[in-house]
C-alpha cells in the first residue's frame, strides 16, 4: 500500500522560517502534490501550493518556494514574517494524487524538539 | 474547443469483437488521462476502463479484465478500446472522457457516447 | 471499492424551488467529490469539482459541500433547464465510483 511521508522543520537561521519535504512511498507515478496547512485539503485547511509534473507550480503567500526533489518528493519553504505566518503547532498535510491508483495523504507538525521531526 | 468523438459501435453478437475509437482534439491529448465510461439502459455510470498520460498506468474493471484493452495512438489523438469476448452485460452507451489532475481527476469533458448492443 | 450513496433517487420540484441532493461515501474521500449533470440522450456534463469549485460556465445557483464521507449538491432556485439526472463522483480511490443517480423532475 503506497504511503506518505511528511517531515517539518524550523530553520535555525530564521526561528518562523518553516521547511516542509513529503515523499510518495509507492509505485504510481505522480500527476500531482498539493501541500496545505490547518488540516488536509478537504478537512478546512488551507492550501499552500500544488505540483504538476508536467505543467509547473503554483503556491500562495506565505509559501515562498516550492520545489521537486525527486520524481516523487517534494519541499516547500515558507515565509517567517507577515500575519499569515506558521507558529510552532501548526500542521501541514501532503497529498500525493497518482492516476489511476487515487490519492493519498498524511500530515506532521514540528516536533516538540529542534531535531526535524519525521511523522507518516 | 475541446472535442471528443467516439465511433465504433454497433450490434454484434455474444462472443463478439469491437473496436471503439474517441477522436481527440482542442488540446494536449498526451498530457491528459483519458478514461471509457459506460451507461447501460436506464442505469448509473460505471468507469470501465482508464490510462494514465504516460500510457502504462491502466485500470479495467474486474469484469471486463482480460477482455477489454484501452490504448491510446498520440500521433492521431485517439482512445481506443478493444473489446473481446462480448457479453450481453456489455451493452451500454460507451463514452469517452478527460481527467483533469487540477481537478482532482474529475471528468471536465466527455464525448456524445456510441452505443454498443451485444444480442444473439 | 468506495461505495457513493446517493439520495433522494427521485425528486419532483417546481421551478424557483430550492434543492438539496446528498451524496454519502463509505469511507472518507478527501476533497475528491465531483458532481455531473445529465440530460436524456446526452453525455454527463461536469458541474462542480473538488467538492465545492464550479466548472467553467456553470451557473452560481449551482453549490457543493461537504467533507470527509458527506456531501450535498444544492441548486438555489431550480430553472426549468435544471431538470436532469444529477451523478455523484469520488475519485480518491481507484476504481473511481458513482453515486446512483437523482432524477429531478417537474411537479
Known amino acids: 500500500t503506497p504511503e506518505v511521508w511528511v517531515q517539518v522543520r524550523m530553520e535555525a537561521t530564521e526561528l518562523s522560517s518553516f521547511t516542509i519535504r513529503c515523499g510518495f512511498l509507492g509505485s504510481g507515478s505522480i500527476s500531482l502534490v498539493t501541500v496545505s496547512w490547518g488540516g488536509p485539503n478537504g478537512a478546512g485547511g488551507t492550501t499552500l501550493a500544488v505540483l504538476h509534473p508536467e505543467r509547473g507550480i503554483r503556491q500562495w503567500a506565505p509559501a515562498r518556494q516550492a520545489r521537486w526533489e525527486t520524481q516523487s518528493s517534494i519541499s516547500l519553504i515558507l515565509e517567517g514574517s507577515g500575519a499569515s505566518s506558521p507558529c510552532a503547532n501548526t500542521t501541514f498535510c501532503c497529498k500525493f494524487a497518482s492516476f489511476p491508483e487515487g490519492s493519498w495523504e498524511a500530515c506532521g507538525s514540528l516536533p516538540p524538539s529542534s531535531d526535524p521531526g519525521l511523522s507518516a | 474547443e475541446v472535442q471528443l468523438v467516439e465511433s465504433g459501435g454497433g450490434l454484434v453478437k455474444p462472443g463478439g469483437s469491437l473496436r471503439l475509437s474517441c477522436a481527440a482534439s482542442g488540446f494536449t491529448f498526451s498530457s491528459y488521462h483519458m478514461s471509457w465510461v459506460r451507461q447501460a439502459p436506464g442505469k448509473g455510470l460505471e468507469l470501465v476502463s482508464a490510462?494514465?498520460?504516460?500510457?502504462?498506468?491502466?485500470y479495467y474493471l474486474d469484469t471486463v479484465k482480460g477482455r477489454f484493452t484501452i490504448s491510446r495512438d498520440i500521433a492521431k489523438n485517439s482512445l481506443y478500446l478493444q473489446m473481446n469476448s462480448l457479453r450481453a452485460e456489455d451493452t451500454a452507451v460507451y463514452y469517452c472522457?478527460?481527467?483533469?489532475?487540477?481537478?482532482?481527476?474529475?471528468?471536465?469533458?466527455w464525448g456524445q457516447g456510441t452505443l454498443v448492443t451485444v444480442s444473439s | 471499492d468506495i461505495q457513493m450513496t446517493q439520495s433522494p433517487s427521485s425528486l419532483s420540484a417546481s421551478v424557483g424551488d430550492r434543492v438539496t441532493i446528498t451524496c454519502k461515501a463509505s469511507q472518507s474521500v478527501s476533497n475528491d467529490v465531483a458532481w455531473y449533470q445529465q440530460k436524456p440522450g446526452k453525455a454527463p456534463k461536469l458541474l462542480i469539482y473538488y467538492v465545492s469549485n464550479r466548472f467553467t460556465g456553470v451557473p452560481s445557483r449551482f453549490s457543493g459541500s461537504g467533507s470527509g464521507t458527506d456531501f450535498t449538491l444544492t441548486i438555489s432556485s431550480l430553472q426549468p433547464e435544471d431538470f436532469a439526472t444529477y451523478f455523484c463522483?469520488?475519485?480518491?480511490?481507484?476504481?473511481?465510483?458513482f453515486g446512483q443517480g437523482t432524477k429531478l423532475e417537474i411537479k
Open positions: 472522457a478527460r481527467h483533469e489532475d487540477y481537478y482532482g481527476f474529475a471528468m471536465d469533458y
Open positions: 463522483q469520488q475519485a480518491y480511490r481507484s476504481p473511481w465510483t
Open positions: 490510462i494514465n498520460s504516460n500510457d502504462i498506468n491502466t
